[in-house]
Each structure stands twice: as C-alpha cells, then as structure tokens.
Amino acid sequence: GIAIPRNSGCPNSEDKNFPRTVMVNLNIHNRNTSTNPKRSSDYYNRSTSPWNLHRNEDPERYPSVIWEAKCRHLGCVKADGNVDYHMNSVPIQQEILVLRREPRHCPNSFRLEKILVSVGCTCVTPIVHHVA
Amino acid sequence: GIAIPRNSGCPNSEDKNFPRTVMVNLNIHNRNTSTNPKRSSDYYNRSTSPWNLHRNEDPERYPSVIWEAKCRHLGCVKADGNVDYHMNSVPIQQEILVLRREPRHCPNSFRLEKILVSVGCTCVTPIVHHVA
C-alpha cells in the first residue's frame, strides 16, 4: 500500500496495488519561479572540461527533446588553451524520470521510465593502475 | 485535438485538451540495462571542482529523495591539492521532471513539476568585468 494519509478529495483508484497506474496532470508547474541569475548556460564553453550539446528527440517520450552533453576532449583544457592529457574530462551523468508512451502512439497513456543522461563534464584526476 | 495518430488500443481520455490529464504506470522501466562501468560515483572526490552530495527528501514528490550537489570550494583544486581562486567551481544544473502529489497526500493523483537540480560541479574560467 501507499504510506500517505488519504485526502478525502482524492480521485478514486481501482488498483490500490503497487506498482500502480496513477493520474498525472501534464500542465507543468515550474518551481523555479525566477530565472536563476547564477545559472549560466555558457559553462559548456568556459569549463576546463568543455562539452558539446547533442539533440536527442523521441516523439514517444515525454519530454520528447533532451539535450545531452558530450565531452570535447579526453583531457582537460589548461590556462594556455592546450589540452592536458594527464587529467580526464568525464561526463557527469544523472538518472532522470521520463514518461514513455505505452502502448506506442497513445496520447494519454504512459509508463515511467528511468534514463541516464549526461548533463555536463568535469575534470578529474585519473586513476592510475600500477603494475607490480 | 491531440497530436498523435491514435492507437486503437489506447485508454479513453475524457479531456483531449492541452494541457491534459494522462494515465501513468509507476512500474518504472529502466533503460540502463547494465550498470555503466564508466559511470563512476567517485567523480565528486576526484574532480578539480569537487562536490558534496546533500539528501533532499519530500514525501509529496515522486521521486521523494533527490541528491543535490554542492561545490566544496569557490575555486578549483590544483595538482598540489591547493585551491586556485583564479578559477571557479560552479554547479552544473539541470531541469528535471518530477511528480508532485495533487491534491496533497493523494496516492494516485499527481501533477508534473519542473525542478532545478545541481548534478555535479565543473571548473570554469571566470568572467572578468573590466571597469573603464
């Protein structure tokens, strides 16, 4: 069962089991009321581990369009603009929830899906394996 | 009208308007079939812009637990372990979709919500504003 005290104004549900089918209002509420001034969209160019953004579109998914990061270099960019291959540019990945149309092409029926997306890149010290 | 060639096996929907309420199966399908060996969980320590992970829990949200990154330093860590304040550690943020119980405490009724989460940190060259 679900661990939440029931609100008497809740919609009825035929299936009380978990996993279960729920009603979701797709009118997205935006918690980020104001544009965050510290949220820069040019980090991908200014980072020592810069990345490019690749467009991934799937009409059977909600959201249909996801922009994915791909690190530009294996190494990290130094102050002089050259790449330091003693360091590694690596993607920072996150598992996010998306909705997948199920059955396919159905406008009002979805299944939750977990996908792994690369959000940006960071510069890390490599793990060095010493051979005995 | 709704923008998808209708599959005859789709559930009925009373409201065809946009925005609309849809059915979602919460039995999560995981697209990431195998654990990605390159998806390292120690980047937060090995990065030149290391971060700590903070647990954010909200029982009215699905998923109820989200881990948020907070950069450890204003500057970036150099090879000698000291912090270089001529560079900046900045959070890489992403807007993600979550489900918010609506009305509150209802187990089977949600609304999509967009929230901004910090996934990790990257080291960037600062923007220098020159005063004339």
Partner: antibody
Framework: EVQLVQSGAEVKKPGSSVKVSCKAS????????IHWVRQAPGQGLEWIGV????????FYNQKFDGRATLTADKSTSTAYMELSSLRSEDTAVYYC??????????????WGQGTTVTVSS | EIVLTQSPDFQSVTPKEKVTITCSAS?????IYWFQQKPDQSPKRWIY???ELASGVPSRFSGSGSGTDYTLTINSLEAEDAATYYC?????????FGQGTKLEIK
C-alpha cells in the same frame, strides 16, 4: 497571447554579417526550442537550425554550419540568429518559430512575422 | 537528406471542389506536417503529426498517409483556402520542406 516579434528589415553588403532577433512573449520561454527557417523570394522554406534556450544547445543544417550562429537570452526571452559571410543567395525572409520540447508532436506552432534580409552591393 | 516532392505544383480549382495535395518522401518518415502560407504572411501550422488539425483549421481539411506517401485533402474548397501549402518532415536531419503547392480559386 503567444507572440514572436522579430526585428526589422536589413540591407547588407556581401561578406558582412546580419543578426536577427526574435522576442518571445505569452509563454515560458525555456519550455520551447526556437527554430529558424528562411524563404528566398518566390521560393520554398528552408530549415536553418535550432537553439534550445534552456540548455544553450544548438544544432544546424549542415548547409549553414559555420556561418549561422543561434543564441538566446533567457533574461529577455529573446532568440538571435546571426548569419556571416553574406552572399546574394542569402537574400530571404528569415522566420523564427517555437517548438515544444516536451511533446514534439505539436511541431512548429507559432511563427514570427519574418525579417527581410537583402544582400546587395 | 530526405527530399519531399509535392504534387501538383499549382492547381486552379473551383469552389466546392475536392482538392488533394500529395507529398512523397524519398525515404520513410514517421509523421508529416502541413503549413499554409498566404502572400506576405508567415506560414501557419495547418496539420500536425499527419492527421491532426491545428486550432482554427476548418474540418473540411484532413491529413492522411504513412511511410513515404502523405496527403492533404480539402473536401469542399472555399475561397479562403487559396494559399500555398507546404509539407514538412522532421524524422531526419536536416529537416526539410516540400517545394509547395499553390492553390488558386477559379
């Protein structure tokens, strides 16, 4: 009311650059990508590329890659298209149009009024 | 690049007549989109995702097709339908448009 209002007509010399703006209002700017399409006099429509104001991502029709630069300013809900190394064949009406990121089935639903760019020596 | 070929290029039609515009794709695509454009105006989204009429589009219009062959049909042409119609695909980059079909009222 959703509106995409573009900057005024431009006359440019060959080899120079032009920057067209597209100010959006009446919706959440970052929920939609901005696509750019052009139409040469008496001709059909040609897709230039896309900018995602949310992530800063861009993707171009290869024909324009390297010459077109698409940007957006979230603080003013304005998208920009800059085209460099102009030649006479770039004389066209340039349109911005929005595209819903969450449900792409809706396609390009609202268009700007168009900006005429004339390239002439 | 996927080439969209519309037929006919031009059609002069009498009011109340049925009109069919076809759009043939050089490779299979998922959906087709149709835009209407009148002289000195921006294109208007007319039919989206092959079948769906955009808001305000009269019900005399319909869209159909799959794979490589798509159709826009006007059941009973009216004077206000005089315009150029473009088909559009976004299944493959670069996104492309048909050359347009100009409808004229006799």
């Amino acid at each position: 009311e959703v509106q995409l209002v573009q900057s005024g007509a431009e006359v440019k010399k060959p080899g120079s650059s032009v920057k067209v703006s597209c100010k959006a209002s009446g919706y959440t700017f970052t929920d939609y990508e901005i696509h750019w399409v052009r139409q040469a006099p008496g001709q059909g429509l040609e897709w230039i590329g896309v900018n995602d104001p949310e992530s800063g991502g861009t993707f171009y029709n290869q024909k324009f890659d390297g010459r077109a630069t698409l940007t957006a300013d979230k603080s003013t809900s304005t998208a920009y298209m800059e085209l460099s190394s102009l030649r006479s064949e770039d004389t066209a009406v340039y349109y911005c149009t929005r595209y819903y990121r969450y449900e792409s089935f809706y396609g390009m639903d609202y268009w700007g009024q168009g900006t005429t760019v004339t390239v002439s020596s | 690049e996927i080439v969209l070929t519309q037929s006919p290029d031009f059609q002069s039609v009498t009011p109340k007549e049925k009109v069919t515009i076809t759009c043939s794709a050089s490779s299979s695509i998922s959906y087709i989109y149709w835009f209407q454009q009148k002289p000195d105006q921006s294109p208007k989204r007319w039919i989206y995702a092959t079948f769906e009429l955009a808001s305000g589009v009269p019900s005399r219009f319909s869209g159909s097709g799959s794979g490589t062959d798509y159709t826009l049909t006007i059941n009973s042409l009216e004077a206000e339908d005089a315009a150029t119609y473009y088909c559009h695909q976004r299944s493959s980059y670069p996104w492309t448009f048909g050359q347009g079909t100009k409808l004229e009222i006799k």
